[in-house]
Amino acid sequence: VLEVYYTHLRCRCVQESSVFIPRRFIDRIQISPRGNGCPRKEIIVWKKNKSVVCVDPQAEWIQRIMEMLRKKSSSTPPVPVFKRKIP
């Protein structure tokens, strides 16, 4: 599930990881676009074991997942802008 938030007023990620997490172990992905008090895009991943990690947006594996989710979202009806969930 992918969520896009536009409401954060500060950065949430202190450090970012580029360590690969297969999508089968990902529960949820939250994207905070840059702006609103944070100068960078942030990607937060909730794993199936309940742990949470900030992921480097430049990591190739997360870009592949994002691209796949974008493709899937383009074939489903739109949902509210503030919180987009893409299965």
């Epitope: 360590v19 690969f20 999508r23 089968r24």
Partner: antibody, heavy 123, light 106 residues
């Protein structure tokens, strides 16, 4: 040649504990996630646990969560499965398997498997 | 949890023939399906991953296809060593195996 050799199986009473081991060779063990999968007497395959390449992340299905613990020793090229509070439904052949490449980005499944070690839970 | 319904549970076929096994997922698994061959006394052997990608060293007699919830696996020109039990595995959301298909010589 990739080799995975399981050991530690046996007969154990319900409520008891057992620790399985898997010795890996023929590949860079510390670069791969590893998994345990079991085959029940009815010949069904069930995923049991997965651990990341560095050992920091572990994942379990609900039916073993809190009872089983997967761990690894990258210095010894060994994978472990500590099983406690065992039930009759845990009776199975237990296989260790090499999982995804931790430094990559390909979502590949388990590719090499051992020959298994048998666990029987019975009073 | 995702369920995988594999069929048939058993089938018999002749040498040189062709067989097809199907797996239906309880939800879209985005082509993240693998197929394994399992023989007694050995560990399962990965044949195909990501629906249709053959593992190195696996002959092209083996093939896979599908999308969404529906997937199939075929073996053509059956050889004696092909008679075994076959399992599908979804790895889109944790792991779930199909119930297996035992392939026997007719």
């Amino acid at each position: 040649e990739v080799q995975l050799v399981e050991s530690g199986g046996g007969l154990v009473k319900p409520g008891g504990s057992l620790k399985l081991s898997c010795a890996a060779s023929g590949f860079t063990f510390s670069s791969y996630a590893m998994s345990w999968v079991r085959q029940t007497p009815e010949k069904r395959l069930e995923w049991v646990a997965t651990i990341s390449d560095g050992g920091s992340d572990a994942y379990y299905p609900d039916n073993v969560k809190g009872r089983f613990t997967i761990s690894r020793d990258n210095a010894k090229n060994n994978l472990y499965l500590q099983m406690s509070h065992l039930k009759s439904e845990d009776t199975a052949m237990y296989y260790c398997a090499r999982d995804y490449y931790g430094s990559g980005y390909e979502d590949s499944p388990m590719d090499y498997w051992g020959q298994g070690t048998s666990v029987t839970v019975s009073s | 949890d995702i369920q995988m319904t594999q069929s048939p549970s058993s089938l018999s076929a002749s040498l040189g023939g062709k067989v097809t096994i199907t797996c239906k997922a309880s939800q879209d698994i985005n082509k993240y399906i693998a197929w394994y061959q399992h023989k007694p006394g050995k560990g399962p052997r990965l044949l195909i991953h990501y629906t249709s990608t053959l593992q190195p060293g696996i002959p092209s007699r083996f093939s896979g296809s599908g999308s969404g919830r529906d997937y199939s696996f075929s073996i053509s020109n059956l050889e004696p060593e092909d008679f075994a039990t076959y399992y599908c595995l979804q790895y889109d959301n944790l792991y779930t195996f199909g119930g297996g298909t035992k392939l026997e010589i007719k």
